[in-house]
Interface confidence: low
């Protein structure tokens, strides 16, 4: 009688992650008596996947009823496949022995390849904000896909970007792969509402790419422009000076008024107006009692925006043009923000 052969008819099997893999195996004879075991890999480091005789294998089911006397079909199904299940699976016949069964013959092996979807791309921007005209880098990462072939594109507000570098890891064979891309983006003053998009296309996505986004509002800092103007006299001996803070982002801003270099008042931008491009405007007033000054007054509006070094704008107030009232010692009044001062 011809010696038993273990036949694994499929050289390779391709399965999508989450699905069930069927690994086929048949024996050509019932003799010798003994169990079948399935292994992933060969040699001493191989992993036991299924043992007909004993053990608990929650993800593995047999195709046929192995308890039937004449059964020669030892095919198995492995459920809920992940990329980590990729590898070569061997169906091995053992001969009944005492005390232990002895390996008798192995099938040629079936290579299980897994198609796995990439994870949702995660886009991250620079750690610190940057100002318009500067170039900043964005990274995009996606993991866990198989096979290795993948396409990644970058967009800013729908326009494809060309300045980027992409790597797929690892370089050699692996159960699953990761992609990492870095794109360079030049910021403009209009970018508060802009978005950077990373788009990943893979065979498992059936033409419906995955996208990750980053809002440039998290990245950009638009420094303010300052304008100090003197308003018409509100009352005799009083001059109203305004500091217009325009086109800044983000909102975090502190303003300090200085009279001849001495701090008169500090306030934080609260009630701001928003421009169409997402930047903010704000205005602060200072009511100066000119009768308290003998000489001309240098008024400075100093602004610290988003933790950056202060910028300032000055205005010279000519005291000589106003009659001086004796006995008054108040140089300036706290007026607060534009919400509380409607002149």
């Amino acid at each position: 009688e011809e010696e038993l052969q273990v036949i694994q008819p499929d050289k390779s099997v391709l399965v999508a992650a989450g699905e069930t893999a069927t690994l086929r195996c048949t024996a050509t004879s019932l003799i010798p008596v003994g169990p079948i075991q399935w292994f992933r890999g060969a040699g001493p480091g191989r992993e036991l996947i299924y043992n007909q005789k004993e053990g608990h294998f929650p993800r593995v089911t047999t195709v046929s009823d192995l308890t039937k006397r004449n059964n020669m079909d030892f095919s198995i199904r492995i459920g809920n496949i992940t990329p980590a299940d990729a590898g070569t699976y061997y169906c091995v016949k053992f001969r009944k022995g005492s005390p232990d069964d002895v390996e008798f013959k192995s099938g040629a092996g079936t290579e299980l390849s897994v198609r796995a979807k990439p994870s949702a791309p995660v886009v991250s921007g620079p750690a610190a904000r940057a100002t318009p005209q500067h170039t900043v880098s964005f990274t995009c990462e996606s993991h866990g896909f198989s096979p290795r072939d993948i396409t990644l594109k970058w967009f800013k507000n729908g326009n494809e970007l060309s300045d980027f570098q992409t790597n797929v890891d690892p370089v050699g064979e692996s159960v699953s792969y990761s992609i990492h891309s870095t794109a360079k983006v030049v910021l403009t003053r209009e970018d508060v509402h802009s978005q950077v998009i990373c788009e990943v296309a893979h065979v498992t996505l059936q033409g419906d790419p995955l996208r990750g986004t980053a809002n440039l509002s998290e990245t950009i800092r638009v420094p303010p422009t300052l304008e100090v103007t003197q308003q018409p006299v509100r009352a005799e001996n009083q001059v109203n000076v305004t500091c217009q803070v325009r086109k800044f982002y983000p909102q975090r801003l502190q303003l300090t008024w200085l009279e001849n270099g001495n701090v008169s008042r500090t306030e934080t931008a609260s009630t701001v107006t928003e421009n169409k491009d997402g930047t903010y405007n704000w205005m602060s007033w200072l009511l100066v009692n000119v009768s308290a000054h003998r000489d001309d007054v240098k008024l400075t509006c100093q602004v610290e925006h988003d933790g950056q070094p202060a910028v300032s704008k000055s205005h010279d107030l000519k005291v000589s043009a106003h009659p001086k009232e004796q006995g008054s010692n108040t140089a300036a009044e706290n007026t607060g923000s534009n919400e509380r001062n409607i002149y």
Partner: antibody
Framework: EVQLVQSGAEVVKPGASVKLSCKAS????????MHWVKQAPGQGLEWIGA????????TYNQKFKGKATLTVDKSASTAYMELSSLRSEDTAVYYC???????????????WGQGTLVTVSS | DIQMTQSPSSLSASVGDRVTITCRAS??????LNWLQQKPGKAIKRLIY???SLDSGVPSRFSGSRSGTDFTLTISSLQPEDFATYYC?????????FGQGTKVEIK
């Protein structure tokens, strides 16, 4: 044959840091989670955390966050664990052990390194 | 975190004895439990995975079983090389946790 070879014993002063290594051979290194386990003298085993070399994804036991930092050098098939701000209670043998990513049950904690003894002493 | 309560913490037995070590999980872990063997100065060795599957090269006198959240390691006939410390390890949920260990000593 898969082998995990760990770096040699270390004696370090309190407050200092130490970086342990675990070199894998005999298989595709990147396909596995590399775990680290602590065993204080005369005590049981405690899981510290794990790293997945493909993308350096890490998972930590909350107890060891801030104490242990796991990194990997894929090209050298080596995993590292840095222990910082060392105190006497960090004196222990530290083991690396390997598990397949989302594995079939067969691959969890199957291979173990020989362990590295870290002694914290002034 | 899942607590693994292992008992006894130590036991004395003779060669040829039947030895049973148990581990109780504080919540359902399915069958995701390993049994490990540790000998002084040697690398830790996994004996059993998925509750009852014997690792390659592990003698058949070792066996594992489960009843709900109670897990048992049985050595049917203790041999001189089996004197060691045994740990259970759950890998159902991170952080992965070990039992406190059982030291098997010679009587």
């Amino acid at each position: 044959e898969v082998q995990l070879v760990q770096s040699g014993a270390e004696v370090v002063k309190p407050g200092a840091s130490v970086k342990l290594s675990c070199k894998a051979s005999g298989s595709t290194f990147t396909s596995y989670w590399m775990h680290w386990v602590k065993q204080a003298p005369g005590q049981g085993l405690e899981w510290i955390g794990a790293i997945y070399p493909v993308n350096s994804d890490t998972t930590y036991n909350q107890k060891f966050k801030g104490k242990a930092t796991l990194t990997v050098d894929k090209s050298a098939s080596t995993a590292y664990m840095e222990l910082s701000s060392l105190r006497s209670e960090d004196t222990a043998v530290y083991y690396c052990t390997r598990s397949f990513y989302y594995s079939l049950d067969a691959a969890w904690f199957v291979y173990w390194g020989q362990g590295t003894l870290v002694t914290v002493s002034s | 975190d899942i607590q693994m309560t292992q008992s006894p913490s130590s036991l004395s037995a003779s060669v040829g004895d039947r030895v049973t070590i148990t581990c109780r999980a504080s919540q359902d872990i399915g069958s995701r439990l390993n049994w490990l063997q540790q000998k002084p100065g040697k690398a830790i060795k996994r004996l059993i995975y998925a509750t009852s599957s014997l690792d390659s090269g592990v003698p058949s006198r070792f066996s594992g079983s489960r009843s709900g959240t109670d897990f048992t390691l049985t050595i049917s006939s203790l041999q001189p090389e089996d004197f060691a410390t045994y740990y259970c390890l759950q890998y159902a949920s991170s952080p992965f946790t070990f039992g406190q260990g059982t030291k098997v000593e010679i009587k």
